[in-house]
């Protein structure tokens, strides 16, 4: 089958997911497309433990995650519920700031230098993190 049972080369395994950390920048949509072409998605942070893991690997660098409000409400790219899920915004964020002079507000979320989240202009070329889940079935013991 096409189920993934181990992480690809250059990806990091953690808690049954695989993560890939970029070392260059792209706009949010281009980063999202890169991950999709790798059969993955921009990272979806579902716990404080996952937040600390990602933060440890990216360091103090602005880095895109799979969270945006380009169509109105905030949404995770994999469908994880935003309202009831984990959040780690900086104080006063998200603020949809229009004062940057680039047109429009701020619709894409990124990790800031201290790991907390901020919304920013989606066209900014930030680093990004891809995530793909390992085959759920492979965690179960084989049927005898």
């Amino acid at each position: 089958g096409s189920e993934r049972t181990c992480c690809p080369v250059n990806w990091v395994e953690h808690e049954r997911s695989c993560y890939w950390f970029s070392r260059s920048g792209k706009a949010w949509a281009d980063a999202d497309n890169y991950c999709r072409l790798e059969d993955a998605h921009l990272v979806v942070v579902t716990s404080w433990e996952e937040q600390k893991f990602v933060q440890h690997h990216i360091g103090p660098v602005n880095t895109w995650m799979g969270l945006h409000d380009q169509n109105g409400p905030w949404k995770w790219v994999d469908g994880t519920d935003y309202e009831t899920g984990f959040k780690n915004w900086r104080p006063e964020q998200p603020d949809d700031w229009y004062g940057h002079g680039l047109g429009g507000g701020e619709d894409c979320a990124h990790f800031t230098d201290d790991g907390r989240w901020n919304d920013d202009v989606c066209q900014r070329p930030y680093r990004w993190v891809c995530e793909t889940e390992l085959d759920k079935a492979s965690q179960e013991p084989p049927l005898l």
Epitope: S24, D39, P125
Partner: antibody, heavy 121, light 107 residues
Framework: EVQLLESGGGLVQPGGSLRLSCAAS????????MTWVRQTPGKGLEWVSV????????FYADSVKGRFTISRDNSENTFYLQMNSLRAEDTAVYYC??????????????WGQGTLVTVSS | DIQMTQSPSSVSASVGDRVTITCRAS??????LAWFQQKPGKAPKLLIY???SLQNGVPSRFSGSGSGTDFTLTISSLLPEDFATYYC?????????FGPGTKVDIK
């Protein structure tokens, strides 16, 4: 030796269909995204479509969206381009290539030898 | 879409010459730029990726540089087998787009 071999090109009338195949040898395509690029004397090289390793995600140039479909059969180490509603401007040499993920992007190498598609009445 | 332009469109050179080809993107593509060589009747061959990384098996007389919107391919000392057409390609954003090509022919 890593090789890609296209087939399925030929002469077709406007509005007709063709299915191109790209057979890989020397490597397993299930580990890679794969892509199609075409070349015409007038427009030069034009990226057409790309498909992820599992086949779950694909992307298309606007000029072919809704008419062309990329697909793959990893068990046969082959991928395809189904071309419908063909137009004269689709006349080109069609190349397949491996799309290797390195340094934060996808790079096309190697390429097949190409197959000629001619759309004419 | 990101437009790619190349200059010159053709260049006449002699064996041993240093040849420089430039590629310009209509917007910033960071270092997501490739260079290809194509000979008549053959498929393009990847020479350089990520603006300056030499593809395996490509001779070191080929080099690439640049970032953002302006890029350069240099052939330090032209050999007979280098007479061909050279294309740049951006892989920053879909649709990935190619330059129109630069033909290097014999003076």
């Amino acid at each position: 030796e890593v090789q890609l071999l296209e087939s399925g090109g030929g002469l077709v009338q406007p509005g007709g269909s063709l299915r191109l195949s790209c057979a890989a040898s020397g490597f397993t395509i299930s580990n890679y995204a794969m892509t199609w690029v075409r070349q015409t004397p007038g427009k030069g090289l034009e990226w057409v479509s790309v498909i992820s390793a599992s086949g779950g995600n694909s992307f298309y140039a606007d000029s072919v969206k809704g008419r062309f479909t990329i697909s793959r059969d990893n068990s046969e180490n082959t991928f395809y381009l189904q071309m419908n509603s063909l137009r004269a401007e689709d006349t080109a040499v069609y190349y397949c290539a491996k799309a290797r993920a390195v340094a934060g992007s996808h790079w096309f190498d190697p390429w097949g030898q190409g197959t000629l598609v001619t759309v004419s009445s | 879409d990101i437009q790619m332009t190349q200059s010159p469109s053709s260049v006449s050179a002699s064996v041993g010459d240093r040849v420089t080809i430039t590629c310009r993107a209509s917007q910033d593509v960071n270092n997501y730029l490739a260079w290809f060589q194509q000979k008549p009747g053959k498929a393009p061959k990847l020479l350089i990726y990520a603006a300056s990384s030499l593809q395996n098996g490509v001779p070191s007389r080929f080099s690439g540089s640049g970032s953002g919107t302006d890029f350069t391919l240099t052939i330090s000392s032209l050999l007979p087998e280098d007479f061909a057409t050279y294309y740049c390609q951006q892989t920053n954003s879909f649709p990935f787009t190619f330059g129109p090509g630069t033909k290097v022919d014999i003076k």
